[in-house]
Structure formats: structure tokens, C-alpha cells
């Protein structure tokens, strides 16, 4: 017997659907109507034929009451080839839902997204996460998607992007966006970061994550942030192969005084990099290749320093920095 494509947990909280059949019975997803978290994986299906069975241009207001009765707050849609027109139709209908967090992963969006009709309501998301989503429209995809969202987006995550740079002149500002995560875009690099951080489009960023993004030096990142006018409180540069030395010809970069937390763990560092901010609340240098305890003059003024998992740190070694705190837990590096 074929397993049921959708599974709802005992609390009607989480529902996961895996549609792997060539012609899936989409009505099976109806059992997810009372779930708060819904995941729908379409097994790599091309949803183009689906367009013939739905009227993507129908007025979504006719579904408003039904959609409002859905419990879903977090929706994940994955593994499909989706016509942009169908995506837009879904976003228009979901605008009447309670959906707050949307994740799109392993999708290929084909065709172009039509402009938002004057009478249409945008989707009031607080979080949008994209992983391995390709868009036929290239660099303009974010601007096209943005017009279907209300301006209150707080968290934006873009991983494994085929085009992590955006068409900045078309993108509107994200006035409420406090967290931007561009992690897992190894081809991004510092020049790509400059292109992705559209100047003055991210005025409220507090947390910026750049794990595994091909960054080379903290100074290079500093320059990209300065050029974009982005002043995060927290910056995650972990899982990049960082160079400790700065190119002597590169201009010195002044870090924003807003930055108080910097994560440089798993960065392959053999010494503390030059050009760090002068003062930090939190500095994570764990799981690097530091062969000796950093000297006070190599480090910023820092309240909470983590050095676990470095070769020099053998049990019984004195703490390397006055006022620093080491967890005592040796991480698996």
C-alpha cells in the first residue's frame, strides 16, 4: 500500500505532505487545515499543468472567509517547478490568511510575476526564507516578489541563491527588516555582498548573517557594510575562510559603533585578524586554529570572549583575556 502523502501530528500542530506521485491527489492536503505549521513537498513536480485547472486571475476575495479559517502560521513549500503566475495566485489568496512565516525551498520559478493589481492586498509576512530558489527573471526577482508583500517583513533569509545580487534600483526599502541572512551562498564574496546590500534599502538591520559566503577579511566586510549604510548590532562571519592580514593598500575601515557582537568561529584563523572593531560585547573566535593565546593588544575591548576549540587551549590554561568568559565546554570543531 502507498503511504498517505500527508501526516498530521497528534496535536493538530504540524502537518507534512510529501507528494511524490506523478499525479498527486492534492485534496489529501485538506487534513492540514487545522495545523499551525504546514510543509508541502511536491517531489520535483512541474506545476505548469495545474494552471489549467485553476483560475489564477480569479478574485481571491471570494476565498477570504475560507482562507482566514486556516490555522497556518508557518508554511514551507518545496521541491517543485512553479509558474510565477501560480505563485502569485497563491500569494494573493494567502494574503487573507494568518500566515506569518513563509519558506520556499528547492523551487524553480518559471515566467515573470505580473505586477500587483491596485485592489490587491499584500501578504503580511514577518519572515520569508528562500533556499535554492531559482527565478526566470534573474536579478529583478526580489523587486517582483516584494510588491506582493506588505512592508512589515522582519526576517529575510536567502540561501543557495542562483542570483544573490539584486536589481537595487527596482527594490523598495524594507523599513522593518531587522534580520538579513545571506548564509550558504559560497559564491557571494565581498563584491557580491556590496551588490546584495542595496544602499539604504535595509535601514533597520540589526542582525546580519554571512556564514559560508566566501568572505575573505573582516575589513572587506566592513567596507561593504559602510558602502551600503548597513549598521548591524550582530554580525555572523563564521564558516568563512578568513585571512587574518589586511591588504596594505586597502583603505582602513571604521566599523559602526552599533556593532556589539561578532562571530568569527570556524573561520580557519591562525591569528586574531587585524581591523576588528575597537569595542565589542561578544566576540566568538571558537573552533579556529589559534596556536597561542591572543595578546590583549590583539583583541578588541570585549566583555564576552569565546576561544573554545582552539589548539592552544589545553585544560588548565589560564584565560587569555581579563574579564573574558569561556564556557568550559569544548565544542565539537
Amino acid at each position: 500500500t502507498t503511504p498517505e502523502p500527508c501526516e498530521l501530528d497528534d496535536e493538530d500542530f504540524r502537518c507534512v505532505c510529501n507528494f511524490s506521485e506523478p499525479q498527486p491527489d492534492w485534496s489529501e492536503a485538506f487534513q492540514c487545515v487545522s495545523a499551525v505549521e504546514v510543509e508541502i513537498h511536491a517531489g520535483g513536480l512541474n506545476l505548469e499543468p495545474f494552471l489549467k485547472r485553476v483560475d489564477a486571475d480569479a478574485d481571491p476575495r471570494q476565498y477570504a472567509d475560507t482562507v482566514k479559517a486556516l490555522r497556518v502560521r508557518r508554511l514551507t513549500v518545496g521541491a517543485a517547478q512553479v509558474p510565477a503566475q501560480l505563485l502569485v495566485g497563491a500569494l494573493r489568496v494567502l494574503a487573507y490568511s494568518r500566515l506569518k512565516e513563509l519558506t520556499l525551498e528547492d523551487l524553480k520559478i518559471t515566467g515573470t510575476m505580473p505586477p500587483l493589481p491596485l485592489e490587491a492586498t499584500g501578504l503580511a509576512l514577518s519572515s520569508l526564507r528562500l533556499r535554492n530558489v531559482s527565478w526566470a527573471t534573474g536579478r529583478s526577482w526580489l523587486a517582483e516578489l516584494q510588491q506582493w508583500l506588505k512592508p512589515g517583513l522582519k526576517v529575510l533569509s536567502i540561501a543557495q541563491a542562483h542570483s544573490p545580487a539584486f536589481s537595487c534600483e527596482q527594490v523598495r526599502a524594507f523599513p522593518a527588516l531587522t534580520s538579513l541572512d545571506l548564509s550558504d551562498n559560497p559564491g557571494l564574496g565581498e563584491r557580491g555582498l556590496m551588490a546584495a546590500l542595496c544602499p539604504h534599502k535595509f535601514p533597520a538591520i540589526q542582525n546580519l548573517a554571512l556564514r559560508n559566503t566566501g568572505m575573505e577579511t573582516p575589513t572587506g566586510v566592513c567596507a561593504a557594510l559602510a558602502a551600503a549604510g548597513v549598521q548591524p548590532h550582530s554580525l555572523d562571519l563564521s564558516h568563512n575562510s578568513l585571512r587574518a592580514t589586511v591588504n596594505p593598500s586597502a583603505p582602513r575601515c571604521m566599523w559602526s559603533s552599533a556593532l556589539n557582537s561578532l562571530n568569527l568561529s570556524f573561520a580557519g584563523l591562525e591569528q586574531v585578524p587585524k581591523g576588528l572593531p575597537a569595542k565589542l560585547r561578544v566576540l566568538d573566535l571558537s573552533c579556529n586554529r589559534l596556536n597561542r593565546a591572543p595578546q590583549p593588544d590583539e583583541l578588541p575591548e570585549v566583555d564576552n570572549l569565546t576561544l573554545d576549540g582552539n589548539p592552544f587551549l589545553v585544560p588548565g590554561t589560564a584565560l587569555p583575556h581579563e574579564g573574558s568568559m569561556n564556557s568550559g565546554v569544548v565544542p565539537a570543531c
Epitope: 496535536e11 505549521e37 479559517a69
Partner: antibody, heavy 105, light 106 residues
Framework: LVKPGGSLKLSCVAS????????MSWVRQTPEKRLEWVAS???????YYPDNVKGRFTISRDNARNILYLQMSSLRSEDTAMYYC?????????WGQGTTLTVSS | QSPASLAVSLGQRATISCRAS??????????MHWYQQKAGQPPKSSIY???NLESGIPARFSGSGSRTDFTLTINPVEADDVATYFC?????????FGGGTKLGNQ
């Protein structure tokens, strides 16, 4: 007793059911006996908060040790209440005995 | 939630009402629940999703209603039922509770 602006972490040790399989919540009861939902966490660790505590309170869980936590910071006088941990997300099938928090200078 | 307090003779019926500002129904489920709280104790689930009796709760307790209007009925009332009863909705964020109904004996 905690001063305004202070922090506190509450713990709730669960027993008698498979802790890791259930959503858990914190609910508080004010001195006026009004009940208020404070935070919820799914079995997988997804968190939900009402706006009045979002950014100040953090719910977390340790499924290996069957412990539910509530980290509270920037405490205000209006956070004074009896805090209960409870099993469930939509509704609360089982409740702990509660712990009293007083926020006052 | 009404009334704020209620005095009922033992053996009689007690009816407590809860009205939501909008429908709390979703695809056949009504997200309204009832709790009993005795003095000095935590609340205890009595009825969940409008009409489902929590295990261990006597069949004298019943819940009814849909959309915006819900009722908790205790019939017949026994001395052990003296408590405060709260309704709670989990349809619209944030989940909210009624102000409570204090049930006493006449």
C-alpha cells in the same frame, strides 16, 4: 522578587508523558486572577509569543532532560504573576503547580 | 464571560457562557476551551474544543456552542464543583482567556 529591568529564568521539569512529542506553553495568572498566555514552543522547537512579551521573553526546551524554560529579561511591574508551565499549544491539558514572580523595586 | 459569579443549589444545573468577538470555528473545530480552578490550585482542563470532555472529568460537565457563543454546563452541581471557571480561545493570536466565573453553592 526581581527589580524592574531585571532578568530571571524559570524551569519546569516534566514527567509522566513523552515530553519531546508535545508542544509546551507558559501561562501566567495576574494578582487580579486574570489568565494570560505567555509563550509556546512546538515539539520541534518553534516558538510563539504574544506581542507584549516578544523580544523580552524566550521559551526553550531540553528534550533530553524533559525541561521547559522561560528566560525573562527587561522585567516590568506588570509581569508580576503566578507563572504556570502547561502541556499543549491550542489548549492546556496539564498544568504545573506554578511559581510566583514579583517585580518590584 | 458571564456571569462573573454564580450561586447554584446542589443538584441543580449551572450554566456559564462565553462569547467571542468573532467566530472561533475552523473547518469543523471550535477553538474554545474550558478550565476549572479551585482555590490555591492551578487551572485544570475540563472541556477542549467546545464539546470534548477531558479525561478524568465527570460526565456532569458538558460543553456546547459554535462560532461565537459557547456554554459550559454542570448538571447536577456537586459540592466539589465550587471553583472559578475560565474559557479560552485559541483561534486568533494572541490566545485569550475569559475573566472567569466564580461558582458557589447556594
Amino acid at each position: 522578587l526581581v527589580k524592574p529591568g531585571g532578568s530571571l529564568k524559570l524551569s519546569c521539569v516534566a514527567s509522566g508523558f513523552t515530553f519531546s512529542s508535545y508542544a509546551m506553553s507558559w501561562v501566567r495568572q495576574t494578582p487580579e486572577k486574570r489568565l494570560e498566555w505567555v509563550a509556546s514552543i512546538s515539539s520541534g522547537g518553534t516558538t510563539y509569543y504574544p506581542d507584549n512579551v516578544k523580544g523580552r521573553f524566550t521559551i526553550s526546551r531540553d528534550n533530553a532532560r524533559n525541561i521547559l524554560y522561560l528566560q525573562m529579561s527587561s522585567l516590568r511591574s506588570e509581569d508580576t504573576a503566578m507563572y504556570y508551565c502547561a502541556r499543549g499549544y491550542y489548549d492546556y491539558h496539564y498544568w504545573g503547580q506554578g511559581t510566583t514572580l514579583t517585580v518590584s523595586s | 464571560q458571564s456571569p462573573a459569579s454564580l450561586a447554584v443549589s446542589l443538584g441543580q444545573r449551572a450554566t456559564i457562557s462565553c462569547r467571542a468577538s468573532e467566530s472561533v470555528d475552523s473547518f469543523g473545530n471550535s477553538f474554545m476551551h474550558w478550565y476549572q480552578q479551585k482555590a490555591g490550585q492551578p487551572p485544570k482542563s475540563s472541556i477542549y474544543r467546545a464539546a470534548n470532555l477531558e479525561s478524568g472529568i465527570p460526565a456532569r460537565f458538558s460543553g456546547s456552542g459554535s462560532r461565537t457563543d459557547f456554554t459550559l454546563t454542570i448538571n447536577p452541581v456537586e459540592a466539589d464543583d465550587v471553583a472559578t471557571y475560565f474559557c479560552q480561545q485559541s483561534y486568533e493570536d494572541p490566545w485569550t482567556f475569559g475573566g472567569g466565573t466564580k461558582l458557589g453553592n447556594q
